[in-house]
């Protein structure tokens, strides 16, 4: 048999080999396609199938406008005037070249060290299914789930059966002050064997954030408090996503869950010391605040009555 590739919407003529050039002809066309369930023999007189396929006076079969449902097998059998039988067999596949791919919502700026959306590449109106690929500085980007990730979506138009492909690219750009990377997207058709078509390239700038600024605030101000008062320590580290905050006392990590606020209720001498907070950001590592000293003013009589000494951790609370 012969493989035929036809463009959707275009006419297609299949020759019935060995058929007399004009009637009378002894020939039979039959087809098995998306429009049939088994073999359909076409009536030589024509009829309701004529809009899809009909036999021409020379015995060829005309498909006036090929559609997706016409993919399949077409066979002709003819007997010439000497009684010799000839068979023709065609395997028809169809295609439609989509519009040039484009990048929607292209990013103007990416943040170094942070996963950032580059854009969404769209190819509309193709058949059969092709593939979208991303390129950075001319090289194919392979998703690794870490620094490069791609989210793909395929939709099929309910009426035409044509495909729309979408591919969203996320990258975690490296810092280092080199030239910003150039991104492009390409569509490779499933049929026929054709070169890929490319979008225009985009070149978002890469912003490199400085180190985290971590500030520690204390209430009441100054850090000198009377016994039994409550001290509130607040750690500020503006960043997206919000960093995790851990607390230190006298250079030792406090065994508490992360929180931006540390409460010291009813302070006693055991709570005295130097406090700092450590902000840990997924893309920027840990950054420690300047320390703050907490002192409990006990008056002239020595330690406050009833205070227990020790680490004082039993009295700490996280807001």
């Amino acid at each position: 048999g012969q493989n035929i590739t036809a463009r959707i919407g275009e006419p297609l003529v299949l020759k019935c080999k060995g058929a007399p050039k004009k009637p009378p002809q002894q020939l039979e066309w039959k087809l098995n396609t998306g429009r049939t369930e088994a073999w359909k023999v076409l009536s030589p007189q024509g009829g309701s199938w004529d809009s899809v396929a009909h036999v021409l006076p020379n015995g060829s079969l005309l498909l006036p406008a090929v559609g997706i449902q016409d993919e399949g097998t077409f066979r002709c059998r003819t007997t010439n005037r000497n009684g010799k039988e000839t068979k023709s067999n065609y395997r028809v596949r169809v295609y439609q070249i989509p519009g040039k791919p484009e990048i929607l919502d292209p990013a103007s700026e990416l943040t170094a060290g942070i996963p950032s959306k580059v854009g969404t590449c769209v190819s509309d109106g193709g058949y059969p299914l092709g593939t979208l690929s991303w390129h950075m500085d001319g090289k194919l980007l392979v998703p690794d789930g870490k620094g490069v990730s791609v989210k793909e979506q395929t939709r099929r138009h309910p009426d035409t059966g044509l495909f729309t492909l979408q591919s969203e690219l996320m990258v975690t750009p490296a810092g280092g002050g080199g030239p910003p990377p150039t991104f492009s997207c390409s569509f490779s058709p499933g049929l026929p064997r054709r070169r890929a078509s490319y979008t225009a390239p985009i070149q978002p700038s890469v912003w490199e954030p400085g180190p985290l600024e971590v500030r520690l605030l204390v209430e009441p101000e100054g850090g000198a408090v009377a016994p039994g008062e409550t001290v509130t320590l607040t750690c500020e580290a503006p960043a997206q996503p919000p960093p995790q905050i851990h607390w230190m006392k006298d250079g030792m990590s406090l065994p508490l869950p992360p929180s931006p606020v540390l409460l010291l209720p009813e302070v006693g001498p055991q709570d005295e010391g130097t406090y700092s907070c450590v902000a840990t950001h997924p893309n920027r590592g840990p950054q420690e605040s300047l320390p703050i000293s907490i002192s409990v003013e006990t008056g002239e009589d020595g330690p406050t009555a009833g205070s227990e000494g020790g680490s004082g951790l039993g009295t700490l609370a996280l807001a």
Epitope: E37, Q45, S48
Partner: antibody
Framework: EVQLVESGGGLVQPGRSLKLSCVVS????????MTWIRQTPGKGLEWVAS????????YYPDSVKDRFTISRDNAKSTLYLQMNSLRSEDTATYYC????????????WGQGVMVTVSS | DIQMTQSPSSMSVSLGDTITITCRAS??????VNWFQQKPGKSPRRMIY???NLADGVPSRFSGSRSGSIYSLTISSLESEDVADYHC?????????FGSGTKVEIK
């Protein structure tokens, strides 16, 4: 909204002629095959004639072949049925319908027009 | 020519009943069978296309099925507005052929 409006029916003597028209709106006329179907009083439906979208192919059952002619004017979005040598058995309500090929199986119908063949 | 043998010719049923009308094709017509509803004094309305597909705006109590050369229209939980004549049609081969019709009425 898709509309098909037939006209031209009436009482006619056997052997005489009559021409039915069907003006359509609400869709791209030249994208579709069109068909005339008739219904005799108290009886079933019968296919009368079909025409392809360009108008260059026409199809008839033996009962009306060589007497009836289906045609179309795509510029006017109008379908016609020229009926010659009318017989009493042609008495029926005639419907104009969209379709006739395997891709569109009569999804829209006109309101029908009555043709009575009687002396 | 293809014959479409439709049965029954009429049926008298109760509201809420489930009914099935069948058409037998005398030769293979594939999926190319439609069902039409026709109320008195009105034009036919397509209900099922290509044997099993529900036409736009048709209530889901209507369904079409096929077993070999037998095509069926089923109305589940019949309502008063379903009282009508029902016709099948094969449009695979010329001459296009309708069934003889089934009249559905309420007891």
């Amino acid at each position: 909204e898709v509309q098909l409006v037939e006209s031209g029916g009436g009482l006619v003597q056997p052997g005489r002629s009559l021409k039915l028209s069907c003006v359509v709106s609400g869709f791209t006329f030249n994208n579709y095959w069109m068909t005339w179907i008739r219904q005799t009083p108290g009886k079933g439906l019968e296919w009368v004639a079909s025409i392809n979208n360009s108008g260059d192919n026409t199809y008839y059952p033996d009962s009306v072949k060589d007497r009836f002619t289906i045609s179309r004017d795509n510029a006017k979005s109008t379908l016609y049925l020229q009926m010659n040598s009318l017989r009493s058995e042609d008495t029926a309500t005639y419907y104009c319908t969209r379709g006739g090929d395997i891709t569109t199986g009569f999804d829209y119908w006109g309101q029908g027009v009555m043709v009575t063949v009687s002396s | 020519d293809i014959q479409m043998t439709q049965s029954p010719s009429s049926m008298s049923v109760s509201l809420g009943d489930t009914i099935t009308i069948t058409c037998r094709a005398s030769q293979d017509v594939g999926i190319y069978v439609n069902w039409f509803q026709q109320k008195p004094g009105k034009s036919p309305r397509r209900m099922i296309y290509r044997a099993t597909n529900l036409a736009d705006g048709v209530p889901s109590r209507f369904s079409g099925s096929r077993s070999g050369s037998i095509y069926s229209l089923t109305i589940s939980s019949l309502e008063s507005e379903d009282v009508a004549d029902y016709h099948c049609l094969e449009f695979d081969e010329h001459p296009l052929t309708f069934g003889s019709g089934t009249k559905v009425e309420i007891k």
